[in-house]
């Protein structure tokens, strides 16, 4: 899978002589609108209410450590995370839930109740969504928390469970 | 809270002359790009099916005016609403719908149906999102409906009801 | 609604000379910050687990053609899909799953199961959306399955099925 | 080292005005929200106002809602209470907070860094 | 306005204690709460930020927990210099607000 790298800062970026010298479509390319963005899917073994993901997945002008995806340009982003549950439901209802959070702050959560008929089913299936448009500070870490991390269906559908971020619009 | 106001039209950009002079990378930060978002919690009380927001929020380049976003700078705008409802069932089925309307028009809905079983339970949480992309005039409203408007979690999940709008592609 | 034709390739764009000669506003606003996106709602009338759109909606730099969006520009798009399901409940609980494919390959699922209770009642619904974050080359296409296409609510709400792309980041 | 200096105290008659400073220093000031706490002898915390790091999202407390103003000048590194119309029950030990967030949305994170605090008695 | 009700407003414990104070918000905050302490004649001092994240320098004998509203603050082994007042404080809206405080007072 794709792993990028963020070029020179535009304050770096040498618009006047070098190559591109007075062309303007070479100028414009280099130009300072910087984009940054992650799409990361959940790691196959989880085994605590932080998830983890696999680190192979895209990542441009955003770090992943521990479980954390780390924010390398301030501005603001679009977070986006889904994930898809299978529930062997048990005699009673289940609340799924599932927790954005910045630098350990909860900001958003979604919860879902299921096998609420209070019957042993064979199976459950439920997805579950959350987004959030935040401003992000350079260093921001942005983590997942699902209290009901063995209910996350990692082996039947293991690209369904992503943490996706990006740039909508710098801090320039 | 934060309410940005958007800088001149970029018909007003001094692109040449000022301080910018030749600086090309001056004239690119302050070329025509423009970006509008808006990013706003739902009221804390709810007493009709028109939702009210909280005009503290995220507003850039959008007003906020009697439940409705008024957009200021016609373009593409991808449009998401997402709600967090808890439904204490009584003794039949529920169905949670979420409107959002264009011009006091329906332009999209999401239904879900809760409480399925027909069993009076303690409490069942289910989240609602709908999203739109549409080109929006100057004075566009952008509104939400909610018939079900008492089965809205405010108090346990104030964060977690939300109105965002943001520019994908301004019109010119 | 609205279909839009894609200007010339931005290598043919004239930044020296022309009309545009010296103007830098003008020649901002032909800069090669390409956008390419689609919304599409579902066709009235489904028959296949393959669904198909209706090509009158919004189309930028993407066609459609037999059920497939085709991308025009290569680049990390951002696609999501949306449907509303209306379940006349057997006496079994239904899994409704939506697809995303890309290149016919499957690249995301979301999967809720409905009707749990088992018991018949008049009607469930159900919303269930998608969405990925994936770098597209050209001629790429992108489509929907649905196995149980003839829960999809085509009549009741015409306007909820949907199918949208975007384009995030060029490859430039 | 992270420091907040607070100025501006002292002893005025109810119905006057003060202007409270705070001097920061040791971290970037204009990327985090700042707060201002006060405490009455003998008495808890009380939260007085906060503002974003860009000014754009500011907050009071009910108590103090129309006659105190918070400002900040991110050149000089400097946070302000503006004190109009005191009351005796304005009384108290003025703090000046630095918060972990930017205030934006609501991003507040809790505080991190205390000044020592400057004290204000409202008395005829 | 959002309550903060601490409990209980002072207890007296020995060195060596085990000591838990609780702290609950009249309407859910998430994890959106910070504990702090503070001696007399000072400024009080940050110890604990996200109802459980340890502020850098505090030590691992103060933990935070809790999610919603409820929530506890607990110093597993009290030491002489933890005798103090603690108050919690939220700040997920305005207007922030604060425990009335718990007085910890040598036995």
């Known amino acids: 899978q794709r792993t990028d790298s963020i070029p020179n800062s535009p304050d770096n970026i040498p618009l006047r002589g070098g190559n591109c010298s007075e062309d303007l479509l070479c100028i414009l390319k280099r130009a300072p609108f910087k984009k940054s963005w992650a799409y990361l899917q959940v790691a196959k073994h989880l085994n605590k209410t932080k998830l983890s993901w696999n680190k192979d997945g895209i990542l441009h002008g955003v770090r992943y450590q521990d479980g954390n995806l780390v924010i390398q340009f301030p501005g603001l982003y679009f977070i986006i995370c889904q994930l898809q549950f299978l529930v062997q439901c048990p005699n009673n209802s289940v609340d799924l839930k599932l927790e954005l959070l910045i630098n350990k702050h909860i900001k958003k959560q979604a919860l879902v109740t299921v096998c609420e008929s209070g019957m042993q089913t064979k199976h459950v299936y439920q997805n579950l969504s959350q987004f959030l448009l935040d401003y992000l500070q350079v260093n921001t870490t942005v983590s997942v928390n699902v209290d009901t991390f063995q209910y996350i269906d990692t082996s039947t559908f293991p690209l369904e469970n992503v943490l996706s971020v990006f740039l909508y619009s710098n801090s320039d | 809270q934060r309410t940005d106001s958007i800088p001149n039209s970029p018909d007003n950009i001094p692109l040449r002359g000022g301080n910018c002079s030749e600086d090309l990378l001056c004239i690119l930060k302050r070329a025509p790009f423009k970006k509008s978002w808006a990013y706003l919690q739902v009221a804390k009380h709810l007493n009709k099916t028109k939702l009210s927001w909280n005009k503290d929020g995220i507003l850039h380049g959008v007003r906020y005016q009697d439940g409705n976003l008024v957009i200021q700078f016609p373009g593409l705008y991808f449009i998401i609403c997402q709600l967090q409802f808890l439904v204490q069932c009584p003794n039949n089925s529920v169905d949670l719908k979420l409107e959002l309307l264009i011009n006091k028009h329906i332009k999209k809905q999401a239904l879900v149906t809760v409480c399925e079983s027909g069993m009076q339970t303690k409490h069942v949480y289910q989240n609602l999102s709908q999203f739109l992309l549409d080109y929006l005039q100057v004075n566009t409203t952008v509104s939400v409906n909610v018939d079900t408007f008492q089965y809205i979690d405010t108090s346990t999940f104030p964060l977690e009801n939300v109105l965002s709008v943001f520019l994908y592609s301004n019109s010119d | 609604q609205r279909t839009d034709s894609i200007p010339n390739s931005p290598d043919n764009i004239p930044l020296r000379g022309g009309n545009c000669s010296e103007d830098l506003l003008c020649i901002l606003k032909r800069a090669p910050f390409k956008k390419s996106w689609a919304y599409l709602q579902v066709a009235k009338h489904l028959n296949k687990t393959k669904l198909s759109w209706n090509k009158d909606g919004i189309l930028h730099g993407v066609r459609y053609q037999d059920g497939n969006l085709v991308i025009q520009f290569p680049g990390l798009y951002f696609i999501i899909c949306q449907l509303q399901f209306l379940v006349q409940c057997p006496n079994n609980s239904v899994d409704l799953k939506l697809e995303l494919l890309i290149n016919k390959h499957i690249k995301k699922q979301a999967l809720v199961t409905v009707c749990e209770s088992g018991m018949q009642t008049k009607h469930v619904y159900q919303n269930l959306s998608q969405f990925l974050l994936d770098y597209l080359q050209v001629n790429t296409t992108v489509s929907v399955n649905v196995d149980t296409f003839q829960y999809i609510d085509t009549s009741t709400f015409p306007l909820e099925n949907v199918l949208s792309v975007f384009l995030y980041s060029n490859s430039d | 080292e992270v420091q907040l200096v607070e100025s501006g105290g002292g002893l005025v008659q109810p119905g006057r005005s003060l202007r409270l400073s705070c001097a920061a220093s040791g971290f970037n000031f204009d990327d985090y929200a700042m707060h201002w706490v006060r405490q009455a002898p003998g008495k808890g915390l009380e939260w007085v106002s906060g503002?974003?790091?860009?000014?754009?999202?500011?907050g009071y407390a009910g108590s103090v809602k129309g006659r105190f103003t918070i400002s900040r000048d991110n050149a000089k590194n400097s946070l302000y209470l503006q004190m109009n119309s005191l009351r005796p029950e304005d009384s108290a030990l003025y703090y000046c907070?630095?918060?972990?967030?930017?205030?934006?949305?609501?991003?507040?994170?809790?505080?991190?860094?205390w000044g020592q605090g400057t004290l204000v008695t409202v008395s005829s | 306005d959002i309550q903060m009700t601490q409990s209980p407003s002072s207890l007296s414990a020995s060195v060596g204690d085990r000591v838990t104070i609780t702290c609950r918000a009249s309407?859910?905050?998430?994890?959106?709460l910070a504990w702090f302490q503070q001696k007399p004649g000072k400024a009080p001092k940050s110890l604990i930020y996200a109802a459980s994240s340890l502020q850098s320098g505090v030590p691992s004998k103060f933990s935070g927990s809790g999610s919603g509203t409820d929530f506890t603050l607990t110093i597993s082994s009290l030491q002489p210099e933890d005798f103090a007042t603690y108050y919690c404080q939220q700040y997920v809206t305005y207007p922030l607000t604060f425990g009335g405080g718990t007085k910890v007072e040598i036995k």
């Open positions: 309407q859910g905050i998430s994890n959106h």
């Open positions: 907070a630095k918060d972990k967030g930017i205030g934006f949305n609501w991003n507040y994170e809790g505080f991190d860094y």
């Open positions: 503002i974003s790091w860009r000014s754009g999202n500011i």
